[in-house]
């Protein structure tokens, strides 16, 4: 039995932060998980994680120097990343691992969210004429 | 899926009973398997649970020390043992198997019941 | 550990009656709640999991309800076969502690 997962297709960051709602097809209040959220095409780079169990607070941290920070809905982590970088545009892919209680579980693999990271555009301001002079 | 349970047990005062719980009908190293108490005129008590995949073991405290849940993987069994044996231990004991249903549990399928009396 | 009180313990009603038995649980369990029914000398059956969800080949005149620490079995029209012993059970965590039971008897 595998776990199904839903994502956007494509996130824009806009501010260099964004909001990916990972949606599962399973309740996570009873249970003790992991979900985690991963960069690239072969998943190679581990962004965030989520730790829960229903009896403890939620633990959320990056490895990989990451900003990121964790909510939870009872069939759903959503992954909130800041400070991104041009350069970090790419596929991103949500997984969950049900750890207790047995059996474990986990997911199918998704179809992964391209987040488009678009760079600060600074606006010029506007041209003010100097003091006038007599 | 089954759940056949051992048959009814007659025991004095201080003795031990173990009690079966053979399934079928499904992949015995999958599912949870929780134990339940049914005193008579009472309601039912849990006592808790064996998960035969990795031999994970949840017991209610109030029956540590009183039973012991095992399993035999080959003849996909699992097994109650019950231990220095009181009147108060008399009741029927339900074996039953916990399904999880998208992340809610449940007990969908329970054996007949082993009746176990405890008499002087 | 979580407590479960379940009311009432017992009670009589008539064919075709609307009766409801209720589950308040100490803590919130988010839904991790089932009912089952029990006849004398039989096993107990599932009626509702994940509070209120109704079991396949389980009639419609039963359902659940509630959320938090509030929850409640109705049988919205009862039938001669429906009496018995009802128990609501939760699993947010362990013991998974069941209610008291309720006895119900048909006038």
């Known amino acids: 039995n595998k776990i199904l997962v839903k994502q956007s297709p494509m996130l824009v960051a806009y501010d260099n932060a964004v909001n990916l709602s990972c949606k599962y097809s399973y309740n996570l209040f009873s249970r003790e998980f992991r979900a985690s959220l991963h960069k690239g095409l072969d998943s190679a780079v581990e962004v965030c994680v989520v730790y829960g169990n229903y009896s403890q607070q939620l633990q959320v941290y990056s490895k990989t120097g990451f900003n990121c920070d964790g909510k939870l809905g009872n069939e759903s982590v959503t992954f909130y990343l800041q400070n991104l970088y041009v350069n970090q545009t790419d596929i991103y892919f949500c997984k969950i691992e049900v750890m207790y209680p047995p059996p474990y579980l986990d997911n199918e693999k998704s179809n992964g969210t391209i987040i488009h990271v678009k760079g600060k555009h600074l606006c010029p301001s506007p041209l003010f004429p100097g003091p006038s002079k007599p | 899926v089954q759940l056949q349970q051992s048959g009814a047990e007659l025991k004095k005062p201080g003795a031990s009973v173990k009690v079966s719980c053979k399934a079928s009908?499904?992949?015995?190293?999958?599912?949870?398997i929780h134990w339940i108490k049914l005193r008579s005129g009472q309601g039912l008590e849990w006592i808790g649970w064996?998960?035969?995949?990795?031999?994970?073991?949840q017991y209610n405290a109030q029956f540590k020390g009183k039973a012991t849940l095992t399993a035999d993987k080959s003849s996909s069994t699992v097994y109650m043992e019950l231990t220095g044996l009181t009147p108060e231990d008399s009741a029927v004991y339900f074996c039953a198997r916990r399904d999880d249903f998208s992340g809610y549990d449940a007990l969908p399928y329970w054996g007949q019941g082993t009746l176990v009396t405890v008499s002087a | 550990d979580i407590q479960m009180t379940q009311s009432p313990s017992s009670l009589s009603a008539s064919v075709g009656d609307r009766v409801t038995i209720t589950c308040k649980t100490n803590e919130n369990i988010y839904s991790n709640l089932a009912w089952y029914q029990q006849k004398d000398g039989k096993s107990p059956q599932l009626l509702i999991y994940a509070a209120t969800h109704l079991v396949e080949g389980v009639p419609s005149r039963f359902s659940g309800s509630g959320s938090g620490t509030q929850y409640s079995l109705t049988i919205s029209s009862l039938q001669p076969e429906d009496f018995g012993n009802y128990y609501c059970q939760h699993f947010w965590g362990t013991p998974a502690t069941f209610g008291g039971g309720t006895k119900l008897e048909i006038k």
């Open positions: 064996f998960y035969p995949g990795s031999n994970d073991i």
């Open positions: 009908g499904y992949t015995f190293t999958e599912y949870i």
